[in-house]
């Protein structure tokens, strides 16, 4: 089930998924002056079987001015700089696929990709929050949000994070061990398909990963 809304907005913070649950869609958006190739995919889809998940479909952009010329998919370093990001630009370390069943990694950029990514998250997805540069994190609990299904409706839990305007940056995800919070943690309820295992996998993974590129717009 796709989540009906975006994850909550926290002032002076951005969020990031460390891995994407099967069923997640990423729209194939191109930057200004470019368009999807003719008959090109509209989105990438995280899918697979019990042992391996990957992104199906490939996003490809071509110049709006030219006809029938396909731009290569492999991004050049200068292309990647054009994506709208915060200062956090160290790349995410690849995760061994087998260690994260039912999830896909962050899709690599494609050439002439739009500056903002439009994701369609699914129930059970967890995103992690980090204060933007120049703001410091005050944790009351986990700085994360989970999309849950309750009574047939989807909702995101509220991340327990406040970003204060001090010229210090916090590590991501969480340089201090956050206190457990019932609201921040997904309880095991049959209606929302979120399990403790999902949480544990992603938490462990988040702790061992380097910071990923943060885009400012997820939908």
């Amino acid at each position: 089930e796709l989540c009906d809304d975006d994850p909550p907005e926290i002032p002076h913070a951005t969020f990031k998924a460390m891995a994407y649950k099967e069923g997640t869609m990423l729209n194939c958006e191109c930057k200004r002056g470019f368009r999807r190739i003719k008959s090109g995919s509209l989105y990438m889809l995280c899918t697979g079987n019990s042992s391996h998940s990957s992104w199906d479909n490939q996003c490809q952009c071509t110049s709006s001015a030219t006809r029938n010329t396909t731009k290569q998919v492999t991004p050049q370093p200068e292309e990647q700089k054009e994506r709208k990001t915060t200062e956090m630009q160290s790349p995410m370390q690849p995760v061994d696929q087998a260690s994260l069943p039912g999830h896909c990694r962050e899709p690599p950029p494609w050439e002439n990709e739009a500056t903002e990514r439009i994701y369609h998250f699914v129930v059970g997805q967890m995103v992690y929050y980090q204060c933007v540069q120049g703001y410091r994190a005050l944790h009351r609990g986990p700085a994360e949000s989970v999309c849950k299904m309750t009574h047939g409706k989807t909702r995101w839990t509220q991340p327990q994070l406040i970003c204060t305007g001090e010229m210090e940056t916090s590590q991501f995800p969480g340089e201090e061990k956050p206190q457990a919070s019932p609201e921040g943690r997904p309880e095991s309820e049959t209606s929302c398909l979120v399990t403790t295992t999902d949480f544990q996998i992603q938490t462990e993974m988040a702790a061992t990963m380097e910071t990923s590129i943060f885009t400012t717009e997820y939908q």
Epitope: L2, L42, H120
Partner: antibody
Amino acid sequence: QVQLVQSGAEVKKPGASVKVSCKASGYSFTRYWMHWVRQPPGQRLEWMGAIYPGNSDTSYSQKFEGRVTITADTSASTAYMELSSLRSEDTAVYYCSRDYGYYFDFWGQGTTVTVSS
Amino acid sequence: QIVSTQSPDTQSVTPKEKVTITCRASSSRSYMQWYQQKPDQSPKRWIYDTSKSASGVPSRFSGSGSGTDYTLTINSLEAEDAATYYCHQRSSYTFGQGTKLEIK
């Protein structure tokens, strides 16, 4: 529950245009791609194009590009498909369909468009 | 433009018979989808990601294949399975021409 309700049957003359509507309910309209697929009598399903109502991004089949325009009114949760320069070969049932990612999970009931002089 | 070709076009079968419908894509794809359509009805999602059954689909239906060749199998046909089945490429949105199953 998710429902896609399409406008009624149309009879048009060659050269005219037709605009079919698809009213969505029971889900967040702006967050799913909406496709238009047609089916001439006794023939295969044929993809015409799609729209992402969240930002009005569209994609069209090369076969119909230039003749088809797909739009969406997010305030009314309604998608529209307009086909111009109609010819007899455009006689078909036209369907709107919601894209769930893995598959088109919900379809409208279909709108019959007959092109005849 | 990717083309999907199904065979056979029409198949006349008796109940309890095993039925196989094939779909060949003009270029290699990762996955194939299948839809079922009955007369005067909208199509219904049936099989996705080559082998996964959509909810409500009887267990006698299964899908398999890879690359360019894909198969929809009905283990023991029932009268309610009489319909036209279409294969569908998710990446290019092309449909096969359909295979009509008739009950003898």
